[in-house]
Interface confidence: low
């Protein structure tokens, strides 16, 4: 007789989640020498310990600290891109502008970066059926609570200029329920802080609204302002040319705007 | 709880072939590297050979390379080791133990181990 | 001849603080983990200390691990009768692409 199950809305664990996360880290601190420390058993040990036997709706923070401490990182903290909505761009950008740093390139946003994991209450079985959704099932899953985790802890490290990239074909181009909008606007420290500077991403090639002036990042602005944090705001009109731009600045067509 | 039974030891001539079998339970056998550690009688520990937990890569001690072949068979939670022209040498307790789960070479220890099994290579 | 050194005896009495070193080289101790193993009579080897210094559940605080450089020390404090064994460390070596044992400490409680 096949033995309950509980059935979630969201799909079920990624397959091989156990040995991409270990490949993950092995690849990781051979690539980061200033990571080469790590013990990516002592990794794999304490991530499975935060989510394995416990029930997948009643994660907290605290089961996700000792894989906090092993996977802790120093980025340089003027260099910190967020992201909402647009994370391959994030992503392309920094694999160009390599002194930048989104979540994905520390060890922790690596391992888990399009992974989805979680357990069962008391079995060390890992769930590879369904997982809780997020808003049809409960928020305090094993997923959501290590990126509101990571996310935290990422903004909480930030100093200078913030950077954050938007996406302007969005209906929402600052969500208040995303992770940028619910947990690291909230996380920036305003005692390190000085200003957040929004990126907002043009989809269409003719699109030449300002869309600095949007509500939601009037809204944005408006959060950030009262957290004592001074708000800039920049167009990026033409997402390849900026890529291409940061490539080679040089470039006698990146003189002029982007 | 963890437990590895290592079978398949016993008498064989020198020149002859022998397979040890090592069967896991109480834990996910496909998370974990194996590996076999040998002791020849009233010597220390060393170290024969390891796979990881997909068997995409073994490793061998220098004096079995060629001759010891570790396998592993995942569904059957099942590690094994193929002993192919034996000696006097490799007369010893074999035992089976449970490594890391990828083999992360920095953090690669014996966590749990058999009972072990006996070979003897003698005419 | 093992490519970690260890003593091959060592000896104390009840109550007393015991120690027991293990000597290697860059490509193992210096460049990766040290763990300690005791072998009691007859039996499997256990897993004593790992990680140069973490203990696994059920192992006393009595035992305890430290690494500096190329070398490493297993400590034994308040020495047992139940401790006589044989005591082995391990590392990995990165140039040999395998594990290493030291040649084993023969701890007799007098």
């Known amino acids: 007789v096949p033995r309950w199950r509980q059935q979630w809305s969201g799909p079920g664990t990624t397959k091989r989640f156990p040995e991409t996360v270990l490949a993950r880290c092995v690849k990781y601190t051979e690539i980061h020498p200033e990571m080469r420390h790590v013990d990516c058993q002592s990794v794999w040990d304490a991530f499975k310990g935060a989510f394995i036997s416990k029930h997948p709706c009643n994660i907290t923070e605290e089961d996700y600290q000792p894989l906090m401490k092993l996977g802790t990182q120093t980025v340089p903290c003027n260099k910190i891109l967020l992201w909402s909505r647009i994370k391959d761009l994030a992503h392309q950008f920094t694999q160009v502008q390599r002194d930048m740093f989104t979540l994905e390139d520390t060890l922790l946003g690596y391992l888990a970066d399009d992974l989805t994991w979680c357990g069962e209450f008391n079995t060390s079985k890992i769930n590879y059926q369904s997982c809780p959704d997020w808003r049809k099932d409960c928020s305090n899953n094993p997923v959501s609570v290590f990126w509101k985790t990571v996310s935290r802890r990422f903004a909480e490290a930030a100093c200078d200029v913030v950077h954050v990239m938007l996406n302007g074909s969005r209906s929402k181009i600052f969500d208040k329920n995303s992770t940028f909008g619910s947990v690291e606007v909230h996380n920036l420290q305003p005692e390190k802080v000085q200003t957040l500077e929004a990126w907002v991403i043009h989809g269409g090639r003719e699109d030449s609204r300002d869309l600095c002036q949007d509500p939601t990042i009037k809204e944005l602005e408006s959060i950030i302002s009262k957290r004592n944090i001074q708000f800039s705001c920049k167009n990026i009109y033409r997402p390849d040319k900026f890529l291409q731009c940061v490539k080679n600045p040089e470039d006698s067509s990146c003189t002029s705007e982007i | 709880e963890v437990q590895l039974l290592e079978s398949g030891g016993g008498l064989v001539q020198p020149g002859g072939s022998l397979r040890l079998s090592c069967a896991a339970s109480g834990f996910t056998f496909d998370d974990y590297g194996m590996s076999w550690v040998r002791q020849a009688p009233g010597k220390g520990l060393e170290w024969v050979s390891d796979i990881s937990w997909n068997g995409g890569k073994t490793h061998y001690v220098d004096s079995v390379k060629g001759q010891f072949t570790i396998s592993r068979d995942n569904s059957k939670n099942t590690l094994y080791l193929q002993m192919n022209s034996l000696r006097a040498e490799d007369t010893a307790v074999y035992y089976c133990?449970?490594?890391?789960?990828?083999?992360?070479?920095?953090?690669?220890?014996?966590?749990?181990w058999g009972q072990g099994t006996l070979v003897t290579v003698s005419s | 001849q093992s490519v970690l050194t260890q003593p091959p005896s060592a000896s104390g009495t009840p109550g007393q603080r015991v120690t027991i070193s293990c000597s290697g080289s860059s490509s193992n101790i210096g460049d990766n983990y040290v763990s300690w193993y005791q072998q009691l009579p007859g039996t499997a080897p256990k897993l004593l200390i790992y990680?140069?210094?973490q203990r696994p559940s059920g192992v006393p605080d009595r035992f305890s691990g430290s690494k500096s450089g190329t070398s490493a020390s297993l400590a034994i404090s308040g020495l047992r009768s139940e401790d006589e064994a044989d005591y082995y460390c391990?590392?990995?070596?990165?140039?040999?692409?395998?594990?290493?044992f030291g040649g084993g400490t023969k701890l007799t409680v007098l």
């Open positions: 391990q590392s990995y070596d990165s140039s040999l692409s395998g594990s290493v």
């Open positions: 990680r140069d210094s």
């Open positions: 133990a449970r490594g890391s789960l990828f083999h992360d070479s920095s953090g690669f220890y014996f966590g749990h």
